[in-house]
Structures are given as structure tokens and as C-alpha cells.
């Protein structure tokens, strides 16, 4: 009860009553003290007297304590993708008495669903609600509506408004939990066949059968198949085992693996399903090729004069493949070219670049040539080697050697003399010139012979025919 | 409509050799893989092998490999079961079915000295 | 190679109840299962081909279910005439395998 204080100046203080007036009531100084937080509602009771007639005993006075927020609660719900639910008490309650009945009770609507809608049962389906009364609620008219999007959660925040006494309830966030509904059909998105060796086993690439589906995962994705008119599938790891079904996953991880055997041209019927739907009639191409085997025939071996061009020809360079290939398309490619000469293309400046790419028609040509480059040093014989690749795909590269004999001693039309220089000599009438090195020099024919034995070792010149108009 | 026929009963003695048809009709014969099932009475169904009919490759079950071969003969629409060396445990009914969804009439081979 | 449980092996029942027929797997076989019906002396008879697709000629009453490795044949308001052996067979990968059958009685 509120007392004043002794002197003028000094404040009202509070304290305890166990009795009061009707005129301490009336002046407005007895108080109610609410002291529990969460407990709205209280009571006491009074003997009431009033000196005229018996007391009035155990009057009890109810107290409705009014929250400084309004007392919204949430409770979190499930709906179906796409489904709609009430939102009615207990999911949504305003506790205690009094405000339930206050007229202009409102929710507004804070945050509005991300997939989904708040909407009134009988209005506009359009968008969501931004606000709506406290009747609707009880009259159940207000529904939450999913989206039907492929989203496993959702939520929004209301807040409660009593307009007429300016008191609001904290933010409540609402979770809603979606349910999933397998609605989406599988679509088959990539189905571009394989191709293959003959005989051979290889995994169907995520990149060749793809399908994609909304609401399931790849490995729900299942293929099951007809009995593949060329061959079996199988699964990596239990290559004896035939299967009929295999999921996007395991194609995702290369696990599925098509073994050929049979015509060349062929396949698997299939129906796609993600469990729920199927999507049936569908055709995966297996189209296999013979294995091209490249071979390389001819003597491999080039035998050149000193210092002159040779060509190669197919006696000694001679590739054809299983296919029966057109020369034109095996294709050698220069790996290691020659250490003692150059090779070269009769069409192009001898001069040019080293050649690095010719063919097996431009072989049987003629044009492919190989030119020796006499040294400093006298030789009798000398070799030189050609590491070339035959490739014409998609047959498998095949490796080759040109072997390249340089010999003084072969019958070279270009180089009538084995000797090492053999010029002959300019003479003038009726005088003398001498036979040197320069003109004349056989030391080749020693070239085999170690540097520190050739002092042993001279070459001797016997002249088996004299010259008729002159004399040495 | 679609038909598997089998050839008819079979009574052999131990030892030899028998070779039951199954002829399809009504459907493009080399699309559908085709099998075959023996049923002993008072025992259930057994799967026996299959054939790849359009690549011509027979895989069978574990407790049929060896003495139990099939064929087919695709100019005929005909696939073959051959059991050599005959037990008598291999008295039974043979069915063949193309897929899962056709079955023959069954063959009934009885295997007795 | 993959297993098939049928259960139970023996079911008796009268006229209009409905039954289900279970067959298990020992591993997933992706709704590779189909279900037969095989009364004596006569073909097996298919009710239903991968775990739940309805087969033309077929009574309704007849009706599948499952995926993975566990399955089901329903059959609502059974009648006299459905009395046979029912067996179920997986046809995912070699070799393929059939269930030991369920014996339906009629009562």
C-alpha cells in the first residue's frame, strides 16, 4: 500500500498490507505488486467488514496478469512437398485468457516463407498474407502452403499486435519441415552409345549415358536392360557376372563395364526409373571396330654412296595396315633423324628444315631422300640411323628403325671411284703436274685400321694401265 | 501371339544323352534372351542357365555346368537343351521361358534303368 | 550368388482375406524381381515383372511392392482359384535365382 511519508517532502514508500479501506481503494493506493515472472495469473482473499451487519469472509479477488509481451508460441510442423497445412492452435497459441479475446488481436508477418505461402482459405492464392487477425486463426482459415520445390526445410517469423492496448509478443520463428515427394520423372539427358575395339572390354563413361532427375539421386537413377544384342555388361571388379540393372552412380565411377563379343554393330534396350516412374523404350549403341594392326615391311636397311642423295623406296621402307590403308594416311613421323647426312623432300628447298613428317605414298614416290655429308676425316664405311614412328589411327603407333650404310665399296653410278678423293688432273700441253693428296688420296682404304697401326700400314698404287700420251 | 513350344516327353536310360527343343514364335526371336528351368517334383523351381540369342553365348547355373549344354539354331527360332551322361536324379519337368514373361508347356524327362 | 528367402513356405487361408508374400534378397537387386504363380502339372505363370509392375490379364487382387532387397506380393480378397505355389525370381545379375516358393492353401 502506498503511505505517505511524515514530512512533507519526504516520498510515498510501498509497504505490505494485511488490512485496507474502501477509501484507500478508491484513492487508487492499494497496489497489486507482480513479483513471478511466467505467472499470469494470481488470486487472494478478504474478509470484508464494515461495522453494520456480519462480515462478508473469504471474498476472493482473481488477478489476470497482462505479459509486457504477448504470449505467442510456435510449434514447429511437417508438410508434404507441395502440400499445405492449418496453421490453428496448438501450432500457433496465444496462452492466458485475455488477449485470445482482445478484437483487434493481429499477426503480422515478419519474414514470409521462402518456399511457400501463407494464404487464407477462401482468398487470392497469389502471394503470401502480411498480416491477418487472431479470429482467422481460430476459425482456421489460415494455411501454410509449400511451393512444391525441392527444398527439405522452410520457415517464417510472426509477431502478435494488440492495437487497442499498444502491446506487441517477440518475433516467432516458425521451422517447417518439408517431406519429400518423388514427383520428378527421370530424363534421360545423354545417350550417345560406345564405341570400341572387337573383342575387347570397356567401361559405358558417365559422359556416353546420363540421366538426371530432380528429386533423386544418382544412385537411385537405375538402367535395367534387355539382353545386349553384342555383347555383356558387367560390373567392375565381377567381370563373370552378367547384369541387367546398374545405377548413374556406379556409371559416374566407371564400375560399368560393356564386354564385346558378336557383330560389330549392336546394343541394349533399356527403361530408366528413379523408383517411382520409368521411363521405358530407351536404346544404347555398342558399335565395336576391327583392330588395325600397322606392319612394317622391307629391308629397313639404306645403303648411300659417299656424299651423295638417295631416295627411299618401298624395298627398303614398306608400312600397310590390317585395314588396307591408303598410303597417303601412314603417316611416319621423324624421332631421331640422321647423324651423318639429312632427310629431305625432293618437292621442297634442300635447303630447308629438317624433314619431320612424311608418308608412306610420298615413300613409293621417290621424294623422301637422304642425303650423305662427306666429313673431314676419310672413311671406308660409316652408319647412320633413322628412329621413325609409323602411326595411322586409330590403329596403335608402331616404332621402326631405317638403318643407313655409307660404304665406299658399293657400285655407285654418282661415284665412279671407291677411293677417297680421286679428282684426275688438270695438265697444260706439253708440261708436267704433280699427282698430290688434294688429287689422289686412298687413305680410306685405311680408315679401318686404329690411328696408332696406320703408321704400319702404307697403300700401295700399281699401275695395271700406263698413260697413252704422257708418262708418270 | 507369342508361343514357346517344347518337344515332348523324354524317357532315357542312365548314361545317355538327351536334347529338348523350345521353338519360339510370334516375336523377333533374337531380342529376347532365353532360359531354361528344371522343376523336380515336390522341390521348387531351379534356374538353369540362359542363352544370349543374339550372340549365341549359354551361361549356366554353378550345379549345371558340365554335363548340360544349350544351343540355338536362330534360322529355326529353336533353342536346344542337351543333358549328357543322364542320372536319374535328372528326371524332372525342363521349362524354357524367353525373358521373364513366356514360358514352354515344359519338357518331362524321366531318367531310369 | 545372390539368395532368395521366400516366407512364409506354407500359408492357409479362407476365401476373401488378403495375403502378403515376402521375398528377401541377399544383397540389392534394383527391382529385378518377378513374381509366378505355378499351380500342378501347369507353366508358371508371371503375376508380376520388376518388384511392382502390373502384367495385362492379370487380376488386380494381384499387387507388388519393394525395392532394394525386400519385396512383396499382395494378394487382396483371395480366392479359391489363386491355391498354387508362388515363387519369386531375381533376374539382376547371372546366375539367376528363384525363391524357395510359398505354398498358398485355401481353405
Known amino acids: 500500500m502506498v503511505s505517505r511519508g511524515a514530512l512533507a517532502d519526504e516520498p510515498p514508500s510501498l509497504d505490505p498490507v494485511q488490512s485496507f479501506s474502501q477509501e484507500a481503494v478508491d484513492t487508487g493506493r492499494v497496489l497489486y505488486l507482480h513479483s513471478r515472472p511466467e505467472a499470469w495469473s494470481d488470486a487472494f482473499s478478504l474478509d470484508v467488514a464494515s461495522g453494520l451487519g456480519a462480515p462478508l469472509e473469504g471474498v476472493l479477488v482473481e488477478l489476470e496478469v497482462l505479459p509486457a509481451a504477448i504470449p505467442l508460441e510456435a510449434q514447429n510442423f511437417s508438410v508434404p512437398e507441395g502440400g499445405s497445412l492449418t496453421l490453428a492452435p496448438p501450432l500457433l497459441r496465444v496462452s492466458g485468457p485475455y488477449f485470445p479475446t482482445l478484437l483487434g488481436l493481429s499477426l503480422q508477418v515478419l519474414e514470409p516463407p521462402q518456399h511457400g505461402a501463407l494464404q487464407k482459405e477462401d482468398g487470392p492464392q497469389a502471394r503470401t498474407l502480411s498480416a491477418f487477425s487472431w479470429r482467422m486463426v481460430e476459425e482456421q482459415l489460415i494455411r501454410y502452403v509449400h511451393d512444391g520445390s525441392e527444398t527439405l526445410t522452410d520457415s517464417f517469423v510472426l509477431m502478435a499486435n494488440a492495437s487497442e492496448m499498444d502491446r506487441q509478443s517477440h518475433p516467432v520463428a516458425f521451422t517447417v519441415t518439408v517431406l519429400p515427394v518423388n514427383d520428378q520423372p527421370p530424363i534421360l539427358t545423354t545417350n550417345t552409345g560406345l564405341q570400341m575395339w572387337e573383342g575387347a572390354t570397356a567401361p559405358i563413361p558417365a559422359e556416353a549415358l546420363r540421366s538426371t532427375d530432380g528429386d533423386s539421386g544418382s544412385e537411385d537413377l537405375v538402367y535395367t536392360i534387355e539382353q545386349p544384342s553384342n555383347g555383356r555388361v558387367v560390373l567392375r571388379g565381377a567381370p563373370g557376372t552378367e547384369v541387367r540393372s546398374f545405377t548413374q552412380a556406379q556409371l559416374d565411377g566407371g564400375l560399368v563395364l560393356f564386354s564385346h563379343r558378336g557383330t560389330l554393330d549392336g546394343g541394349f534396350r533399356f527403361r530408366l526409373s528413379d523408383g517411382e516412374h520409368t521411363s521405358p523404350g530407351h536404346f544404347f549403341r555398342v558399335t565395336a571396330q576391327k583392330q588395325v594392326l600397322l606392319s612394317l615391311k622391307g629391308s629397313q636397311t639404306l645403303t648411300v654412296c659417299p656424299g651423295s642423295v638417295q631416295p627411299l623406296s618401298s624395298q627398303t621402307l614398306r608400312a600397310s595396315s590390317s585395314a588396307g590403308t591408303d598410303p597417303q594416311l601412314l603417316l611416319y613421323r621423324v624421332v631421331r633423324g640422321p647423324q651423318l647426312g639429312r632427310l629431305f623432300h625432293a618437292q621442297q628447298d634442300s635447303t630447308g628444315e629438317a624433314l619431320v613428317n612424311f608418308t608412306q605414298a610420298e615413300v613409293y614416290a621417290g621424294n623422301i631422300l637422304y642425303e650423305h655429308e662427306m666429313p673431314p676425316e676419310p672413311f671406308w664405311e660409316a652408319h647412320d640411323t633413322l628412329e621413325l614412328q609409323l602411326s595411322s589411327p586409330p590403329a596403335r603407333d608402331v616404332a621402326a628403325t631405317l638403318a643407313v650404310a655409307v660404304s665406299f665399296e658399293a657400285a655407285c653410278p654418282q661415284r665412279p671411284s671407291h677411293l677417297w678423293k680421286n679428282k684426275g688432273l688438270w695438265v697444260p700441253e706439253g708440261q708436267r703436274a704433280r699427282i698430290t693428296v688434294a688429287a689422289l688420296d686412298a687413305s680410306n682404304l685405311l680408315a679401318s685400321v686404329p690411328s696408332p697401326q696406320r703408321s704400319e700400314h702404307d697403300v700401295l698404287f700399281q699401275v695395271t694401265q700406263f698413260p697413252s700420251r704422257g708418262q708418270l | 501371339q507369342i508361343q514357346l513350344v517344347q518337344s515332348g516327353p523324354e524317357l532315357k536310360k542312365p548314361g545317355e544323352t538327351v536334347k529338348i527343343s523350345c521353338k519360339a514364335s510370334g516375336y523377333t526371336f533374337t531380342d529376347y534372351s532365353m532360359h531354361w528351368v528344371k522343376k523336380t517334383p515336390g522341390k521348387g523351381l531351379k534356374w538353369l542357365g540362359w542363352?544370349?540369342?543374339?550372340?549365341?553365348?549359354?551361361t549356366y547355373a554353378d550345379d549345371f555346368k558340365g554335363r548340360f549344354a544349350i544351343s540355338l539354331e536362330t534360322s529355326a527360332r529353336t533353342v536346344y537343351l542337351q543333358i549328357n551322361n543322364l542320372r536319374n536324379e535328372d528326371t524332372a519337368t525342363y521349362f524354357c521361358?524367353?525373358?521373364?514373361?513366356?514360358w514352354g508347356q515344359g519338357t518331362t524327362l524321366t531318367v531310369s534303368a | 550368388d545372390i539368395k532368395l528367402s521366400q516366407s512364409p513356405s506354407i500359408l492357409s487361408v479362407t476365401p476373401g482375406e488378403t495375403v502378403s508374400l515376402s521375398c528377401r534378397a541377399s544383397q540389392t537387386i534394383y527391382k529385378n524381381l518377378h513374381w509366378y504363380q505355378q499351380k500342378s502339372h501347369r507353366s508358371p505363370r508371371l503375376l508380376i515383372k520388376y518388384g511392382s509392375d502390373s502384367i495385362s490379364g492379370i487380376p488386380s487382387r494381384f499387387t507388388g511392392s519393394g525395392s532394394g532387397t525386400d519385396y512383396t506380393l499382395n494378394i487382396n480378397s483371395v480366392k479359391p482359384e489363386d491355391e498354387g505355389i508362388y515363387y519369386c525370381l531375381q533376374g539382376y545379375s547371372t546366375p539367376w535365382t528363384f525363391g524357395g516358393g510359398t505354398k498358398l492353401e485355401i481353405k
Open positions: 521361358f524367353s525373358y521373364y514373361d513366356y
Open positions: 542363352i544370349n540369342t543374339a550372340t549365341g553365348e549359354p
